[in-house]
């Protein structure tokens, strides 16, 4: 669909006359008519197939048009089509006298035509006018032409249809040979497709308009590239969606059972070396001069009894200090002066000559110990208490405080580990000599029951469109992952399918 | 009112001429094209051509061409044909009617001119 | 050539019936949307006069009772009513291509 446009500039009659050579009275009021039609080598009778316009009249004898398209539209002359421009044609342009208002052919005198021209050719669509002038015997004429597409029509025979447009069907703008220009932040065929916000994951991610990220079931983030975990995960991380997979230091179903202890607590005190021996599990390592489960009592430097031959001890800020019994002396009161003639050795110890007599040893009886034999026996000396406990002096007896898991007067005993009901998921708890076995219910299995092997919610292939299908552990369910293009709980609504075009 | 009158019958012999006018009035007749229509005794019509009467461009039926010239005169309104090398199967009316580029079609015909060719 | 064939050759009808004459071309006569075809009816004695131009529409005084249809290369004349001024020969013709063509004619009579 186009327009034939033409642009008639100057015509000259200057003698005033008719085609029959009879001249007008009193001049020639020149109105013109047009005829436009297919191309033919020789102009023939017959339709104008391309559409007739008909002017007014537009001045006396010789005249130049004046340019009055903002004026309804009269000169340049529409001749409007609607088909394919074939960029050929013929142009009949007939100038008449008319010499009343009525400018009908049966109400024209006679020989009431001044004159006819007749072309054909090639015109191409475009903008530019073509310029021509054409002389008769006594008459001349200029005028221009050219054609155009009509609105919404482009390409070089104005054949292609395209009408902006900015709504759920398109939101594009013509180029002019009538392909679609995407309007910023649009794309696809026919510009339906929104450009999602840039890195925007192409299959977690997509939009319903520009510049838009919305996540698929399963992801998050601004660029739906990070999974959601298993709902309740505490101390893990998924690599696709509703997965836990524990942190280091963390098991179980939802990682939430404490595998490092030392690590996430750091119970030992004072500079102790912390180990690990099992879940909520550990062992402090003291150093010296410290004492406790968690090595957080602090040792008098006299508790180990360092004076000997019954020095004294006292406690000073930077160590310890031995008060010697007369007959001694030394850092611990080690040295003696004395001799077996000096009857050094208490409590009914036997005194031995040893050096040549410059020295002596005490031989103790039962219960009593020291260089001297001043000393009773300290009952924890022996380490008599098993895995780990800690001796403690009670007057006449002793005790053994155990460390976690032990039981028993002398912690030899271990704490059943099925106490703990480690077996999730109601597995029944074996204790065996060196751990514990689970036995698990039906639908679970691993070594405490923590993995879920239920039917699996994505066997019955529910999610449409070539979806991944992930299980929700926790509730039996399953949570479909759409293709691009797809949404709903199964994917099986298309998102903007493109309509045929509704022109 | 619009008028085409030709001119009287002929009757002429095999290899001769004919001269056929067609005189036309009440219209602008340089606005026209004038056709030649052969009618056959008892047969139906056959084109022979047109002339435009503006620029004299002409175009013939194949089957006429070479026999046949049309011509006009734009002082006295007149269109003519010429027929040579006469043939017996030349005998027939043979009419003028004017056209228009606005195709309304042959909207006015002459009266018709009878040639006999006859030895 | 572009043949145009009429059918039938001739038709009777009486006073006041429907007249339909039926013209098929070889090949289309249509051109951009318009039908180049014409019909004209022929008294005895006298030249032809056109009824119908561009299939369908009225030449100046033809009255109301005839009426063109068709595209392409099928094409009907109806008189609606026929008088008995009616009868005569009526031809179509194609004036798509050079050289113009009418059709072999067909005769109408008074049943």
């Known amino acids: 669909s186009g327009v034939f446009q033409l642009q008639l500039q100057e015509f000259i009659n200057e003698r005033g006359v008719l085609a029959s050579g009879r001249p007008c009275e009193p001049g020639c009021r020149t109105f013109f008519r047009v005829c436009l039609k297919h191309f033919q080598a020789v102009v023939s009778p017959g339709p104008c197939t391309f559409g007739t316009v008909s002017t007014p009249v537009l001045g006396t004898n010789s005249f130049a048009v004046r340019d009055d398209s903002s004026g309804g539209g009269r000169n340049p002359l529409q001749l409007p089509f609607n088909f394919t421009w074939p960029g050929t044609f013929s142009l009949i342009i007939e100038a008449w006298h008319a010499p009343g208002d009525d400018l009908r052919p049966e109400a024209l005198p006679p020989d009431a035509l001044i004159s006819k021209i007749a072309i054909q050719g090639s015109l191409a669509v475009g903008q530019n006018w073509l310029l021509d002038e054409q002389t008769s015997t006594l008459t001349r004429l200029r005028y221009s032409y050219r054609v155009i597409c009509s609105d919404n029509y482009y390409g070089d025979n104005c054949s292609r249809l395209c009408k902006k447009r900015n709504d759920h069907f398109g939101h594009y703008v013509c180029q002019p040979d009538g392909n679609l220009s995407c309007l910023p932040g649009w794309t696809g065929e026919y510009c339906q497709q929104p450009i999602c916000l840039s890195g925007c994951h192409e299959q977690n991610g997509y939009c319903s308009k520009p510049a838009e990220c919305l996540c698929r079931p399963g992801w998050q983030g601004r660029l739906c590239n990070e999974c959601i975990p298993h709902n309740g995960c505490r101390h893990g991380t998924c690599s696709t969606p509703w997965q836990c997979t524990c942190d280091e230091g963390w098991g179980g179903l939802f990682c939430d059972q404490d595998l490092n202890y030392c690590t996430h607590h750091s119970p030992c005190k004072n500079g102790a070396t912390c180990s690990n021996s099992g879940q909520r599990s550990y062992t402090c390592t003291c150093r010296p001069g410290y004492t406790g489960v968690d090595c957080e009592l602090e040792l008098s430097e006299c508790d180990s009894n360092p004076c000997r031959n019954g020095g004294s001890c006292k406690d000073q800020e930077d160590g310890y200090h031995c008060l010697c019994p007369p007959g001694y002396y030394g850092l611990h009161c080690e040295h003696s002066t004395l001799s077996c003639a000096d009857s050094p050795c208490f409590n009914g110890g036997s005194c031995r000559e040893r050096n040549q007599g410059a020295n002596y040893a005490c031989e103790c009886p039962p219960n009593f110990t020291g260089s001297n034999c001043e000393k009773k026996v300290d009952r924890c000396t022996s380490n008599p208490c098993a895995n780990g406990g800690q001796c403690l002096n009670r007057g006449p007896s002793r005790m053994c405080r155990c460390r976690p898991g032990f039981t028993g007067t002398y912690c030899e005993l271990h704490v059943s580990d099925c106490a703990r009901n480690p077996c999730a998921h109601g597995g029944t708890c074996h204790d065996l000599e060196n751990g514990l076995m689970c036995t698990c219910p039906a639908g679970f299995s691993g070594r405490r029951c923590e993995v879920r092997t239920s039917i699996d919610a994505c066997a019955s292939s529910p999610c449409f469109n070539r979806a991944t299908c992930y299980t929700d552990l926790s509730t039996d369910t399953f949570v479909c992952n759409c293709p691009y293009g797809f949404v709903g709980s199964r994917c099986e609504f298309p998102v903007g399918l493109p309509p045929s075009f509704p022109w | 009112q619009v008028q085409l009158v030709q001119s009287g019958a002929e009757v002429k012999k095999p290899g001769a001429s004919v001269k056929i006018s067609c005189k036309a009035s009440g219209y602008s007749f340089t606005a026209y094209y004038i056709h030649w229509v052969k009618q056959a005794p008892g047969q139906g019509l056959e084109w022979i051509g047109y002339?435009?009467?503006?620029?004299?461009?002409?175009n013939y039926n194949q089957k006429f061409k070479g026999r046949v010239t049309f011509t006009t005169d734009t002082s006295t309104s007149t269109a003519y044909m010429e027929l040579r090398s006469l043939r017996s199967d030349d005998t027939a009316v043979y009419y003028c009617?004017?056209?228009?580029?606005?195709?309304?079609?042959?909207?006015?015909w002459g009266q018709g001119t009878l040639v006999t060719v006859s030895s | 050539d572009i043949v145009m064939t009429q059918s039938p050759d001739s038709l009777a009808v009486s006073l006041g019936e429907r007249a339909t004459i039926s013209c098929r071309a070889s090949?289309?006569?249509?051109?951009?949307?318009?039908?180049?075809m014409k019909w004209f009816q022929q008294k005895p004695g006298q030249p032809p006069k056109l009824l119908i131009y561009a299939a369908s529409n009225q030449g100046s005084g033809v009255p109301d009772r005839f009426s063109g249809s068709g595209s392409g290369t099928d094409f009907t004349l109806t008189i609606s009513s026929l008088q008995a001024e009616d009868v005569a020969v009526y031809y179509c013709?194609?004036?798509?291509?050079?050289?113009?063509?009418f059709g072999g004619g067909t005769k109408v009579e008074i049943k």
């Open positions: 013709q194609q004036s798509k291509e050079v050289p113009w063509t």
């Open positions: 002339i435009s009467c503006y620029n004299g461009a002409t």
């Open positions: 009617a004017r056209d228009y580029d606005y195709d309304v079609g042959m909207d006015y």
């Open positions: 090949e289309s006569v249509d051109n951009y949307g318009i039908s180049f």
